[in-house]
Interface confidence: low
């Protein structure tokens, strides 16, 4: 229904601190560099606006839309230009064209500091003396770093921080309790942020049909016994929320998922029976809990596939006529009976399934034709278990760091033109599937596999395509988004690159690594291997294993040395000399 | 599978008009961005403009600003470039260029568009 005032209607739904924290998330967002305490002026003048109309809808400018009001906000930011370049020339436009220049500027990567957390007894002192302050903080500086965060999780998130701090300051060993619990959210939060970008590159690249698509074969295989009309209601619901948050129409998004949360909980008869738990809660945990809930009990009496969509004499007129619908139900009932399988994998079997019929009906015998279709699946199935077996075998016999390292000289190989940093980041999270994943249960490894490692290569791509330097990676990344992750696995070392010179300051280190906390010594170690395999591409796996021990050996010695300063200028080079030696 | 189709080029004086079409087909060309392209003998291809799909979004490169104007017919799935204040250094080939069912134009490399018409020839000279 049509409301007289958006910003009155949206304060209304979402009471005042959950629109706060929706606006503020949405101005770090849209203008990443400005500080908390601007970013704070803004909310708190828009929630006051909010306040006037919420009192009288008929109030001067109480009728403008959201991206207007917004966007003024913006616009009015004091050396705009200076802070943000050409970015301000979205000022000079009209609404919806400066809401999308908004969009289009926003950075994947924006050269900001790693959020670095203080030292607990500082944390408890700063969020007991203001704790929504302290929360504002957590919202901005996360937000501004991943311009693409699912808002109404970010919230859910900040609430997890705020538990937990409260939780662990009233202890007396703050540290040891803060620690294990924050990296936990923050783990998760970092997973959120890469599967969210996923989701808005599919919506941006290929439009809402692909997003839809990608809701039907997840909420399918989540809520097998819901009809196809059910699933279609959840996903076109689903598309419209995450199309809002991509969108940065976040008070829109956060109201509308509340809403598909409060549907789902109201008809779990038809959705699934696994919903109670998380429908007892309250509104951020409960949306946030069926976002992941467990897969229904598929049911028993499902017919084979080929009923409908191989044997049916009416599958060139159901695919002519309905072409749309009919894929869309090949999808359902794929996925439902396949909870096994990644969505990435679904997709590929439907993309496979339409260029079949699209061939096949064109032909004098149509049925002959498409009547193998679901045997031609078998290789496209084979291809991802046995990614998902050679790797979990890896990650087993290597660890995570070990496999991190497998990978990064894998693909540094494939596209060694790719900065150093932005392939040892790509790495470690690749690597990280290990441990997310290959513990679990055998039927669950192969979605948990593919759909993160799709999520991280999607950041590959987006980082590639601000300055595109890899062929390979051009290539892998302009095809569809189900088709990168088997394209990246199939890359082999790329003959066309020149190797890198050796240079000895690449390979050279001091004694402040010794001081270094694990994580950032590994990113150290991890550089040093890429640069190897960048002046060595066709180095072998023994020989790169050669140098990283003798590496590891020597930041050991020279770390436990007494003058490490004298071990460190005097070993490295000896090192260096090493190194050389054993690629030569 | 898309399929690009451009006509309407030719001969024309420096300060002269021509407007090309680029007939698109396709499944939902109309929800793609289409691009235009261009290529002078012994150049790069450069983006010239570009117009969203299903978004009423428009892009040029700065050398044509204010010159030309993009626009589409989704009822005829067809795309034009009106080109006016045409200058020698427009002489290229012109391509229309696709990235099936991305609504933006989010990049300009030319590379990343797997989809190209066979180019049509503008020549601008006196």
């Known amino acids: 229904e049509a409301h007289k005032s958006e910003i009155a209607h949206r304060y209304n739904d979402l009471g005042e601190q959950h629109f706060k924290g929706l606006v503020l998330i949405a101005f770090s967002q849209y203008l990443q560099k400005c500080s908390y305490d601007e970013h704070a002026k803004l909310v708190q003048e828009v929630t006051d606006f909010a306040k006037t109309c919420v009192a009288d809808e008929s109030a001067a400018n109480c009728d403008k839309s959201l991206h207007t009001l917004f966007g003024d906000k913006l616009c009015a930011i004091p050396n705009l230009r200076e802070n943000y370049g050409e970015l301000a020339d979205c000022c000079t436009k009209q609404e919806p064209e400066r809401n999308e220049c908004f969009l289009q500027h926003k950075d994947d990567n924006p050269s900001l500091p790693p959020f670095e957390r203080p030292e607990a007894e500082a944390m408890c002192t700063s969020f007991k003396e203001n704790p929504t302050t302290f929360m504002g903080h957590y919202l901005h500086e996360v937000a501004r770093r991943h311009p693409y965060f699912y808002a109404p999780e970010l919230l859910y998130y900040a609430e997890q921080y705020n538990e937990i701090l409260t939780q662990c300051c009233a202890e007396a060993d703050k540290e040891s309790c803060l620690t294990p619990k924050l990296d936990g959210v923050k783990e998760k939060a970092l997973v959120s942020s890469v599967r969210q970008r996923m989701k808005c590159s599919s919506m941006q690249k290929f439009g809402e049909r692909a997003f839809k698509a990608w809701a039907v074969a997840r909420l399918s295989q989540t809520f097998p016994n819901a009809d196809f009309a059910e699933i279609t209601k959840l996903a076109t619901d689903l598309t419209k929320v995450n199309k809002e948050c991509c969108h940065g129409d976040l008070l829109e998004c956060a109201d509308d998922r509340a809403e598909l949360a409060k549907y789902m909980c109201e008809n779990q008869a038809t959705i699934s029976s696994k919903l109670q738990t998380c429908c007892d809660k309250p509104l951020l945990k409960k949306a946030h809990c069926l976002s992941e809930v467990e897969h229904d009990t598929m049911p028993a009496d499902l017919p084979a596939i080929a009923a409908d969509f191989v044997e049916d004499q009416e599958v060139c007129k159901n695919y002519a006529e309905a072409k749309d619908v009919f894929l869309g139900t090949f999808l359902y009932e794929y996925s439902r009976r396949h909870p096994d399988y990644s969505v990435s994998l679904l997709l590929r079997l439907a993309k496979k399934y339409e260029a079949t019929l699209e061939k096949c009906c064109a032909e004098a015998n149509p049925p002959a034709c498409y009547g193998t279709v679901l045997a031609e699946f078998q290789p496209l199935v084979e291809e991802p278990k046995n990614l998902v077996k050679t790797n979990c075998d890896l990650y087993e016999k290597l660890g995570e760091y070990g496999f991190q390292n497998a990978i990064l000289v894998r693909y540094t190989q494939k596209a060694p033109q790719v900065s150093t940093p932005t392939l040892v980041e790509a790495a470690r999270n690749l690597g990280r599937v290990g441990t997310k994943c290959c513990t679990l249960p055998e039927d669950q490894r192969l979605p948990c596999v593919e759909d993160y490692l799709s999520a991280i290569l999607n950041r590959v791509c987006l980082l590639h395509e601000k300055t595109p330097v890899s062929e390979h990676v051009t290539k892998c990344c302009s095809g569809s988004l189900v088709e990168r992750r088997p394209c990246f696995s199939a890359l082999t070392v790329d003959e066309t690159y020149v190797p890198k010179e050796f240079k000895a300051e690449t390979f050279t280190f001091h004694s402040d690594i010794c001081t270094l906390p694990e994580k950032e010594k590994q990113i150290k170690k991890q550089t040093a291997l890429a640069e190897l395999v960048k002046h060595k591409p066709k180095a072998t796996a023994e020989q790169l294993k050669t140098v990283m021990d003798d590496f590891a050996q020597f930041l050991d010695t020279c770390c436990k040395a007494a003058d490490k300063d004298t071990c460190f200028s005097t070993e490295g080079p000896n090192l260096v000399t090493r190194c050389k030696d054993a690629l030569a | 599978e898309v399929q690009l189709l451009e006509s309407g080029g030719g001969l024309v004086q420096p300060g002269g008009s021509l407007r090309l079409s680029c007939a698109a087909s396709?499944?939902?060309?109309?929800?793609?961005?289409v691009a235009w392209f261009r290529q002078a003998p012994g150049k790069e291809r450069e983006f010239v403009a570009g117009?969203?799909?299903?978004?009423?979004?428009?892009y040029y490169a700065d050398s044509v600003k204010g010159r030309f104007t993009i626009s589409r017919d989704n009822s005829k799935n067809t795309l034009y470039l009106q080109m006016n204040s045409l200058r020698p250094e427009d002489t290229a080939v012109y391509y229309c260029?696709?990235?099936?069912?991305?609504?933006?134009?989010?990049?300009?490399?030319?590379?990343?568009?797997?989809?190209w018409g066979q180019g049509t020839l503008v020549t601008v000279s006196s």
């Open positions: 117009i969203g799909g299903g978004v009423d979004i428009t």
């Open positions: 260029a696709a990235r099936p069912g991305q609504p933006l134009i989010t990049s300009k490399v030319a590379d990343l568009y797997p989809y």
């Open positions: 396709g499944r939902y060309i109309d929800e793609t961005a």
